[in-house]
């Protein structure tokens, strides 16, 4: 007979998996918060800045109680992919003014990428249906001016901060229900 079968593959504790995802999200939230503050110090924002290509915030009211894990993870992954694309674009096309935010923008991009991989892993570990591959997004037009790049940076970092704050809330609550 062949070698004895190995021990059965133990499915990781979903609470522990979710916990490490929450901590990674909080860590990215801290980075985003710090970078947004740095941007405000260097280039004070006059009012709110928006960018049409950014995802709309996943939730605007106190409907956290109705959240389900598959929906939160799928939506969070989609939104963070969009933000990753926007951060990459900002680093490439944002202009010389935003070079002062390096290497922090690069670090943010790497950590965003790490969180996305963690979400992908969590979804497969929890046997959640994998979303279909994203259709190629239309390229983002370069900012019309240096100030346009700065306004875009305010919008991207502000939106990412709110998305991550919302994600932490949702994930923390879902963890208590597991």
């Amino acid at each position: 007979p062949g070698p004895p079968p190995g021990p059965p593959r133990v499915s990781p504790d979903p609470r522990a998996e979710l916990d490490s995802t929450v901590l990674l999200t909080r860590s990215l939230l801290a980075d985003t918060r710090q970078l947004a503050a740095q941007l405000r110090d260097k280039f004070p924002a006059d009012g709110d800045h928006n960018l049409d290509s950014l995802p709309t915030l996943a939730m605007s009211a106190g409907a956290l109680g109705a959240l389900q894990l598959p929906g939160v993870l799928t939506r969070l992954r989609a939104d963070l992919l969009s933000y990753l694309r926007h951060v990459q674009w900002l680093r490439r096309a944002g202009g010389s003014s935003l070079k002062t935010l390096e290497p922090e923008l690069g670090t943010l991009q790497a950590r965003l990428d790490r969180l996305l991989r963690r979400l992908q892993l969590l979804m497969s570990r929890l046997a959640l249906p994998q979303p279909p591959p994203d259709p190629p997004a239309p390229p983002l037009a370069p900012p019309s001016s240096a100030w346009g790049g700065i306004r875009a940076a305010h919008a991207i970092l502000g939106g990412l901060h709110l998305t991550l704050d919302w994600a932490v809330r949702g994930l923390l609550l879902l963890k208590t229900r597991l």
Partner: antibody
């Protein structure tokens, strides 16, 4: 100067509700979350919940879920905490405190609002 | 919920002496490069005041005689040389998980 100013002391009957306000000044209200903390006589501090001024979406300590309601009025830079179905154990000082979910410590506190529940 | 236990419950020292306050968590509160423990000072009739955040970072405006250390489950607040205004109650708080909780406090009294 960064400040959180809370509404005055309240005396309530058991079963009633109380709504406490917390007016923020000296910083951009939407840049931080608002948390609420209870301090009953002789008890440790107890976190009630947290709200993001931009998106709402409060989260609560399970112990207070269903009885505490956190809201904000962005235009007035004011946060509110309502506590319903009051009982004698709710007699305490309630604080609002500025926080954020990344590290979740409280760097600015209101002066506290004393709520007395007595028949 | 994570339970924080502070010791001693009270401590009587003289101005100029060194104070060492302990906070023990029922499970590790350190992860992802952070130790999620914070320290506050509270005087009678006043709101708590943040002293130390993330175990060892001194809050702006807090005197350098205050310092924090520790990781995992054991944390310490040290006051290197006590001043009259340091006699108060000190609380630790964790923010590792929902809900954040506080220790029961250590009352620092003048000997």
């Amino acid at each position: 100067e960064v400040q959180l100013v809370q509404s005055g002391a309240e005396v309530k009957k058991p079963g009633a509700s109380v709504k406490i306000s917390c007016k923020a000044s000296g910083y951009t209200f939407r840049d931080y979350n608002m948390d609420w903390v209870k301090q009953a006589p002789g008890q440790r501090l107890e976190w009630i919940g947290d709200i993001n001024p931009t998106i709402g979406a409060p989260i609560y300590n399970q112990k207070f879920t269903g009885r505490a309601t956190l809201t904000v009025d962005k235009s007035a830079s004011t946060a509110y905490m309502e506590l319903s179905s009051l009982r004698s154990e709710d007699t305490a000082v309630y604080y609002c405190a500025r926080g954020e979910l990344a590290h979740w410590y409280f760097d600015v506190w209101g002066q506290g609002t004393t709520v007395t529940v007595s028949s | 919920d994570i339970v924080l236990t502070q010791s001693p419950a009270s401590l009587a020292l003289s101005p100029g002496e060194r104070a060492t306050l302990s906070c023990r968590a029922s499970k590790s509160v350190s992860t992802e490069g952070y130790s999620y423990i914070h320290w506050y000072q509270q005087k009678p009739g006043q709101a708590p005041r943040l002293l130390i955040y993330l175990a060892s970072n001194l809050e702006s405006g807090v005197p350098a005689r205050f310092s924090g250390s520790g990781s995992g489950t054991d944390f310490t607040l040290t006051i290197s040389s006590l001043e009259e205004e340091d006699f108060a109650t000190y609380y630790c708080q964790h923010s590792r998980d929902l809900p954040p909780t506080f220790g029961q406090g250590t009352k620092l009294e003048i000997k």
